[in-house]
């Protein structure tokens, strides 16, 4: 029979700035029932709150709706666990929800092989930003980053789309059933889960020189090169 | 009220074995757990160790770790203490002791062990 | 394991007196420290929990102190019934400790 052990606060994350979570671990078990509080301040107040909603975030969580939710004001949490023998405090943590975003992941991927005539045939991704996001009011600046792999490969090829929502690849294995996904981050903040993989064959006939890839215009912003598979990599690689 | 009644005096010899029980009533006995501290003639308070009613948890001290299980049995309310290979320093009141709202606020009347050959 | 020194071993008072009884903890224990009162033949009876909060029933002329590794336990004005042992207890940790007992007898 003793107190529970100091839990820790671990993790907090936001999926758009307007809401955010925030998951505790419990301490040792004291072998006895053992309730668990959230209590925060804002930074510059004294008056401490109780969490508003401990369903939404699963066990051991503290949810915070939108009239709890604001920018720009640094939040001070500490989580009581107590039991008949006592209780324990977790150390404070300062959480600002600008810098706790986490997005879903991008939505509606898309992938297609390209074969014009005229030029090298590549592999055309596209995708849309999460809902929740709301890019049209300047707050957020989303970065993409895609993957993908052949089925059977261990190792993933992975490629820096910027703030594009769409992608080309053009170096890849004919023959070969590929996985894309795509994730985002914010400008401040964490990356997103991948999205769900999607599957593309490629064709047998999807052949080009290795030597030299063409980049279309769109990629390089708006001036046409012949660039090498190095400087290739190097442009693609994050 | 809270009670914890505890058996009564057991006389033993060295080598043998002892179980002593503590029956509990008047509070939620599945939320809590029985603590055993003994106490030889003339000495201080030494903990023993504690099983949980509620998640089975038990813990002891390093020196009973070998010879001493505690047991509680929630359709009797009922904590048990057994010491084995008894030797004449097992010489003690034992006592149980629980955690109703606040640490060690219910003891029990105490249960004298004496070992002698 | 964490050692609990209580000081004195002993100690000789009248009716009427304050007394104080200190106890040290080898390591720091959060504050969980409790004190008891054991009479001859008794079981412990607990006054003190978190180091400072009053058992429920115990007189407030009882009262708790200290935090980290030092504590102290002070009866302000010493009755008959007072004349005992006291413990002190640490429950931090396992194993949980006593101190070795502070006898308050009538001068």
């Known amino acids: 029979q003793l107190p529970p052990g100091k839990p820790e606060i671990f993790k907090c994350r936001s999926p758009n700035k307007e809401t955010f979570t925030c998951w505790w671990r419990p301490g040792t078990d004291g072998g006895l029932p053992t309730n668990y509080s959230l209590t925060y301040h804002r930074e510059g107040e004294t008056l401490m709150h109780e969490c508003p909603d401990y369903i939404t975030g699963g066990p051991n969580s503290c949810h915070f709706g939108k009239q709890y939710t604001s920018m720009w004001r640094t939040y001070i949490m500490m989580v009581n666990a107590t039991n008949q023998m006592g209780s324990s405090f977790s150390d404070e943590l300062y959480v600002d929800v600008t810098y706790i975003v986490q997005p879903d992941p991008p939505l509606e991927l898309a992938v297609e092989v390209k074969q014009p005539e005229d030029r090298k045939p590549y592999l055309w991704i596209k995708w849309s930003p999460p809902t929740l996001i709301d890019l049209k009011t300047g707050w957020f600046t989303l970065l993409y980053e895609i993957r993908l792999k052949p089925e059977k490969a261990a190792e993933w090829e992975i490629h820096f789309a910027g703030q594009q929502t769409e992608f080309k690849i053009l170096s890849l294995h004919p023959g070969q059933k590929y996985l894309v996904q795509v994730r985002c981050k914010p400008d401040h903040g964490y990356w997103s889960a991948w999205s769900p993989a999607t599957f593309i064959q490629i064709p047998s006939d999807f052949t080009m020189n290795d030597e030299q890839k063409l980049i279309s215009e769109e990629d390089l912003g708006g001036e046409q090169k012949l660039i090498s598979e190095e400087d290739l990599h190097h442009h693609h690689h994050h | 009220q809270v009670q914890l009644v505890q058996s009564g005096a057991e006389v033993k010899k060295p080598g043998a074995s002892v179980k002593v029980s503590c029956k509990a009533s008047?509070?939620?006995?599945?939320?809590?757990?029985i603590t055993w501290v003994r106490q030889a003639p003339g000495q201080g308070l030494e903990w023993m160790g504690w099983s949980s009613a509620y998640n089975g948890k038990t813990d002891y001290a390093q020196k009973f770790q070998d010879r001493v299980t505690m047991t509680t049995d929630t359709s009797t309310t009922t904590g048990y203490m057994e010491m084995r290979s008894l030797t004449s320093d097992d010489t003690a009141v034992y006592y149980c002791t629980t955690v109703v709202r606040r640490p060690f606020d219910f003891w029990g009347q105490g249960t004298l062990v004496t070992v002698s050959s | 394991d964490i050692q609990m020194t209580q000081s004195p071993s002993s100690l000789s008072a009248s009716v009427g007196d304050r007394v104080t009884i200190t106890c040290r903890a080898s390591?720091?224990?959060?504050?969980?420290l409790a004190w008891f009162q054991q009479k001859p033949g008794k079981a412990p009876k607990s006054l003190i929990y978190a180091a400072s909060s009053l058992q429920s029933g115990v007189p407030s002329k009882f009262s708790g102190g200290g935090s980290g590794t030092d504590f102290a336990l002070t009866i302000s004005s010493l009755q008959p019934e007072d004349f005992a042992t006291y413990y002190c207890?640490?429950?931090?940790?396992?194993?949980?400790?006593f101190g070795q007992g502070t006898r308050l007898e009538i001068k």
């Open positions: 390591q720091d224990i959060n504050n969980f």
């Open positions: 207890q640490q429950y931090s940790s396992y194993p949980i400790t």
């Open positions: 008047g509070y939620t006995f599945g939320t809590s757990g």
